[in-house]
């Protein structure tokens, strides 16, 4: 029985050229997290974080993606094309797979507010 919930930073906005932290957090379960996958809106792979083997950053993003903090991901040098959905997939034992969603809006405006509240989708 899967008892856990994924909390994410929800809908966030950040300005073009800036950076943003994509963060998910698994709670309400004692399951062991074996791997976290990060995917972009077109379901292409951004990064994998295996509990023991560390990080795999997809080459197309290696200059713009920094691992962490924690199991999260920092996306840098944002472009308008970065707008869209991001998914964190937690592979756990024995529960199975949990998935969280974040929507990132990249704004041209220099007054873009970067909200980083956690919410349960």
């Amino acid at each position: 029985m899967m008892t856990g919930t994924i909390e994410t930073t929800g809908n966030i906005s950040a300005k073009k050229g800036g950076s943003v932290i994509l963060q998910c957090h698994l709670s309400s379960t004692m399951a062991q997290v074996t791997q976290v996958n990060w995917e972009q809106h077109d379901h292409s792979l951004l990064a994998i974080r295996n509990a023991e083997l560390g990080w795999h950053i997809y080459p197309a993003f290696k200059d713009r993606v920094a691992p962490g903090p924690g199991l999260g991901l920092t996306l840098q040098s944002l472009t308008m094309n970065d707008t869209g959905e991001y998914f964190c997939t937690y592979h756990t034992y024995p529960d199975g797979t949990y998935r969280g969603r974040i929507f990132l809006e990249v704004l041209e405006s220099s007054v873009a507010e970067h909200s980083a509240r956690f919410q349960i989708p």
């Epitope: 996958n37 023991e52 083997l53 950053i57």
Partner: antibody, heavy 119, light 107 residues
Amino acid sequence: QVQLKQSGPELVKPGASVKISCKTSGYTITENTMHWVKQSHGKSLEWIGGINPNNGGTSYNQQFKGKATLTVDKSSSTAYMELRSLTSEDSAVYYCTRSSYYRYDLDYWGQGTTVTVSS
Amino acid sequence: DIQMTQSHKFMSTSVGDRVSITCKASQDVKTALAWYQQKPGQSPKLLIYSASYRYTGVPDRFTGSGSGTDFTFTISSVQAEDLAVYYCHQHYTTPWTFGGGTKLEIK
């Protein structure tokens, strides 16, 4: 340049154990995860497991849990794999190989160590 | 575990020919796939990583493509020194797994 130099061939009796070494040079061992791969004669490759030299954390293929133990000695930049309770099925070439920095592909390989289990 | 299937154990080709080797994953591995070359009596060598990226120093006649479950490794113009076994390898999830290998034979 990066080099992974493995210990020599081993001829061991059934039921015995063997410890293979992989001496690294040309890079800092703690920067890359080290993996071990088995290749039985004329067969494909099997991933045994990997070890993060930073913290000693290991990830094993379930098939090799209890068979293989991976360790690293940071002071000598050497990775080790111990195989126990050997049978003829364990006769194979064993490779140490490292994964790329922030990638999981295996970019440098040792020359392989042949383990022969025979009475 | 994710099974990696290379449908051709052997492929015969001539120098100068174009040859493609396929690899099929039993489930989606995104682009977390590498290709290795193993020449007789040698250790495997990394050729392609993340499905389509050529590793440093690898000649541009070697290319990789695909994502999800279907992947292709192509040699645009086979050279005599390409005689080897080629393996695909998924690292999307542990245990990492390899294909059975495709032995390229030169006519």
